[in-house]
């Protein structure tokens, strides 16, 4: 008779499981960006140091009343569900409150950076065990706030952010919309998005996953045994600012973008009910529910990927969109996605040392989605090899030509305008191995990765028949790093991953007037880590 | 996740010379100014100013003060509320909006964003 | 129904360690619904709560007991008990175990006690 | 500490009457008080939680009133065996209880 929330993201071999680092003891610490704590609270009570940060503004309204219960109900219940003794996910982990939201909720972003940037010193201070912060606020997109985020992210500290309540895109929100913060939406026990009245839990590309997020029972400020639910993003950010907290305690050098890849790959995949959102961000959104991640000891040396789609591009004839993996990860390949179908392709480029994913509009689109495909491969050396466009008529063959590098991605970009002209690309797995090929007027992309142990292979599914897309799947043990769809039918609206799904979606006029012989085939790169064999293209 | 959201972005390239500084003529903004796109969210009358990455720890301070000083000229006076040294170059300041485009044409400034609410979630 | 039993030694010596256990049948200890509590009422005077424990084994004291009691929990045996250190005729009093609603399950209502067991005297003399 | 101030000590009333037993907070306690009837040679009963709310199987003659820092017992009719020791006990900082007020027969 545990709480819902804990039960779904506590899998039945953790439940008794105290997390602890190798040493004994827990020395992970959470800071609380929030409104002020009720520390004497029983769930919290010698877990929590309020500190005499307070950067808040003036509440609203000459009749509001100081009820101190009140003003301390928000940050109360969230240290609670972080590290509550019997309500929390890390339980008895030690938690900073830093008030930068007053009695009614309301904070500054300028007030938000002194409180990150609190944090930041006191870091440089007493430098001490893992940090995670946790970010349960909202407001309008701040450039600054993610810059602030980013700055912190990069000196190794965690930060969790809530996706926001507005029932909207969650790049529209900072510090949601910060690429270096892990951003997380709301379901409820029905693995379904929160609704709050007329508005719920935000979506879109810039959230990373879902977490518990209503009727969330934990600490209430209303007395220090009192317990009581909440809803929101927030009480989801803290759900995972805990899970966070565990797998550091049992693991504190794993980094952030471990800690993301892992929470990604061990969440509850495709219970989410899309339909919730709009259709336009359906694709964009992420199916994943979060769980708490066994230790890497168990579950050894997997090839992690995670999706990483970029902004819209905008309709403009020259338009590009770009989409970047994190600092640590490899960029695999490359892919990209237009509702209209007219695109110009996708390629991988270099841009201040970064491999990035590009994707180009064609005159009279809508715009177009760049879709990295963005992995942790261990002592990686990647690189791009690319061809220019043949002459008509002729195929551009791409292939990994150093010795022990394997194709994990295959990109193509087309210097004509018209469409109806080009013939599409194909990759080919039977006649020649580890190739991309590329038809008229198509630049191929081929991303060629060495790295100990790394072994990949192709995997095609076709459809004849109308169908609006055509997926493929990696089986068990290998992880998808690359994704694109080799058309039969002129128009095809791109392909991209959803976790280790290839889709390859097709227009609809396409279908309609396709011949049989002409199959759409969705083709995926398939790789694996065996970090004891050597480097190998798989037939 | 990094390309800016639904927000106003605004250049404010004004007159060089409008101060009759020597200095200042030779400095044309290329900062910009950012506000949320929430209207109601905005909390006009304090900004952030955000001065370039590899801004020296002295050089912010003399950044704030010549705001400070430039704005005394004109009749204006400013507070400067929080010097920022570890996360990001920049300060925070409580000035009239008249006083932007002066902001904008300091040397090291990169952007200056109004400040606005964040809510519990 | 849910009873409540507490055995131990009537009778301790100043200095010594108390040491209580209540039986609880009719239910499980383990349910995340209640705390399990010990009260306890010197003869003629009023009742005073010393502290509580969970499940899990997460404890909450009196703070003025706080230094001179530990509770434990034995989820196989569906017990819980008490250890109050250095006691001193102070600690004379009917020691009770109650059950305490969590309020971590909201089902479970709100945190009051009950029901109690019958108590057991306990007194401190030499 | 929330000291909880009980009055009367002792109530002599006849079956039949009203009993108003009070009790006084040293600082508020919201709604977060409740009271136990206790009898001789007996463990305490829970009568009223959450300062008004009956609890299961408690007569409704018993009702409770108040909130901050004073609080009210009533006893509309006392039946015989309603001649105790009452306790209130408040939860709004950690658990502490009322010095007790007797209702003895007249």
């Known amino acids: 008779s545990i709480p819902w929330n804990l039960e779904r993201i506590i899998p039945a071999w953790h439940q008794t499981e105290e997390d602890r680092s190798p040493d004994g003891s827990s020395q992970v610490e959470v800071y609380l960006l929030d409104t002020s704590i009720q520390g004497a609270h029983r769930e919290i009570e010698g877990r929590v140091t309020i500190t005499d940060f307070n950067s808040v503004p003036e509440e609203d309204g000459t009749r509001f009343h100081r009820q101190a219960s009140k003003c301390d109900s928000h940050g109360t219940h969230l240290a609670g569900v972080v590290s509550g003794r019997d309500a929390g996910v890390a339980k008895g982990t030690s938690l900073h409150s830093l008030r930068v939201l007053n009695c009614q909720g309301k904070g500054t972003v300028s007030g938000t950076l002194i409180g990150l940037e609190f944090i930041r010193k006191s870091q440089l201070i007493q430098p001490s065990g893992p940090l995670v912060v946790l970010l349960p606020l909202a407001g309008g997109y701040s450039r600054i706030l993610n810059a602030a985020c980013r700055h912190l992210a990069r000196t190794g500290v965690v930060l969790v952010a809530a996706a926001g309540n507005f029932r909207d895109d969650a790049c529209l929100y900072s510090p949601a919309s910060a690429p270096e913060v892990i951003t997380v939406g709301a379901t409820n026990a029905q693995d379904q998005p929160v609704t709050l009245g007329t508005l719920g839990t935000n979506f879109g590309r810039c959230v990373d996953l879902f977490a518990p997020g209503k009727d969330i029972i934990g600490a209430s400020s209303d007395c220090s045994t009192c317990f009581m639910s909440q809803s929101g993003t927030s009480q989801a950010a803290a759900h995972v600012a805990g899970i966070v907290a565990r797998m550091l305690s049992r693991e504190p050098t794993l980094t952030l973008a471990e800690l993301r890849q892992r929470l990604i790959h061990f969440s509850t995949k495709d219970v989410i009910n899309m339909a919730w959102f709009p259709e336009d961000q359906q694709v964009l959104t992420p199916n994943l529910v979060a769980t708490l991640p066994p230790s890497t000891h168990e579950t050894g040396g997997q090839l992690l990927c995670r999706t990483v789609w970029s902004a819209h591009s905008g309709p403009t004839r020259t338009a590009t969109a770009t989409a970047r993996c994190a600092p640590e990860e490899e960029l695999l390949s490359c892919s990209s996605f237009s509702r209209s179908g007219r695109r110009r392709g996708d390629w991988i480029e270099a841009i201040g040392g970064q491999q990035v994913c590009k994707a180009l509009n064609a005159f009279g689109g809508e715009g177009v989605y760049a879709v990295a495909r963005c992995c942790l491969v261990p002592r990686a050396n990647c690189s791009i090899h690319n061809t220019p466009a043949a002459r008509a008529g002729l195929e551009t063959h791409v292939h990994c030509h150093q010795k022990d590098h394997v194709l994990t991605g295959c990109s193509f970009h087309w210097e004509v305008e018209d469409l109806s002209v080009r013939r599409q690309p194909a990759l080919r797995s039977r006649r020649q191995p580890g190739q991309c090929v590329g038809h008229q007027a198509a630049s191929v992309y081929a991303s060629c990765c060495h790295a100990p142990g790394l072994e990949c292979k192709i995997k095609e599914h076709g459809i004849s028949g109308p169908s609006e897309q055509v997926t493929v799947a990696c089986e068990a043990g290998w992880t998808l790093t690359g994704c694109n769809v080799l058309p039969g039918a002129s128009l095809t609206l791109g392909a991209y991953s959803v976790d280790n799904l290839c889709v390859a979606r097709v227009h609809d006029t396409a279908r309609a007037d396709r011949t049989s012989g002409e199959a759409t085939v969705a083709a995926a790169i398939c790789c694996r880590s065996r970090p004891s064999a050597k480097a190998s293209w798989v037939q | 996740q990094d390309e800016d959201g639904d927000y106003e972005e605004l250049m404010l390239a004004l007159p060089s010379q409008e101060d009759g500084l020597a200095d200042e003529a030779a400095h044309v903004a290329t900062a910009t100014f950012r506000r949320c796109s929430k209207e109601a969210w905005r909390l006009p009358g304090t900004y952030i100013v955000v001065l370039m990455e590899e801004t020296q720890r002295l050089q912010i301070e003399q950044t704030a003060h010549r705001l400070q000083t430039r704005a005394a000229r004109r009749g204006y006076v400013i507070k400067v509320l929080h010097i920022f040294y570890d996360l990001f170059p920049g300060f925070l300041v409580k000035m009239s909006s008249d006083l932007l485009g002066l902001a904008l044409k300091l040397p090291h400034v990169e952007y200056i964003e109004e400040d606005s609410f964040v809510f519990a979630q | 129904q849910l009873q409540l039993q507490e055995s131990g030694p009537g009778l301790v010596k100043p200095s010594e360690t108390l040491s209580l256990t209540c039986t609880v049948s009719g239910g499980s200890i383990s349910s995340s619904s209640y705390y399990w509590g010990w009260i306890r009422q010197p003869p003629g005077k009023g009742l005073e709560w010393i502290g509580s424990?969970?499940?899990?084994?997460?404890?909450y004291y009196n703070p003025f007991l706080k230094s001179r009691v530990t509770i434990s929990v034995d989820t196989s045996k569906n017990q819980f008990s008490l250890k109050l250190s250095s006691v001193t005729a102070a600690d004379t009093a009917v020691y009770y175990c109650?059950?305490?609603?969590?309020?971590?399950?909201?089902?479970?209502?709100?945190?009051?006690?009950?029901?109690w067991g019958q108590g057991t005297l306990v007194t401190v003399s030499s | 500490e929330i000291v909880l101030t009980q009055s009367p000590a002792t109530l002599s009333l006849s079956p039949g009457e009203r009993a108003t037993l009070s009790c006084r907070a040293s600082q508020s306690v919201s709604s977060y008080l409740a009271w136990y009837q206790q009898k001789p040679g007996q463990a305490p009963r829970l009568l009223i939680y959450d300062a008004s709310n009956r609890a299961t199987g408690i007569p409704a003659r018993f009702s409770g009133s108040g909130s901050g820092t004073d609080f009210t017992l009533t006893i509309s009719s006392l039946e015989p065996e309603d001649f105790a020791v009452y306790y209130c006990q408040q939860r709004r900082n950690w658990f502490t209880f009322g010095g007790g007020t007797k209702v003895e027969i007249k």
């Open positions: 424990i969970y499940y899990s084994g997460s404890t």
């Open positions: 109650a059950r305490e609603n969590s309020g971590v399950v909201p089902a479970a209502g709100p945190n009051w006690f009950g029901p």
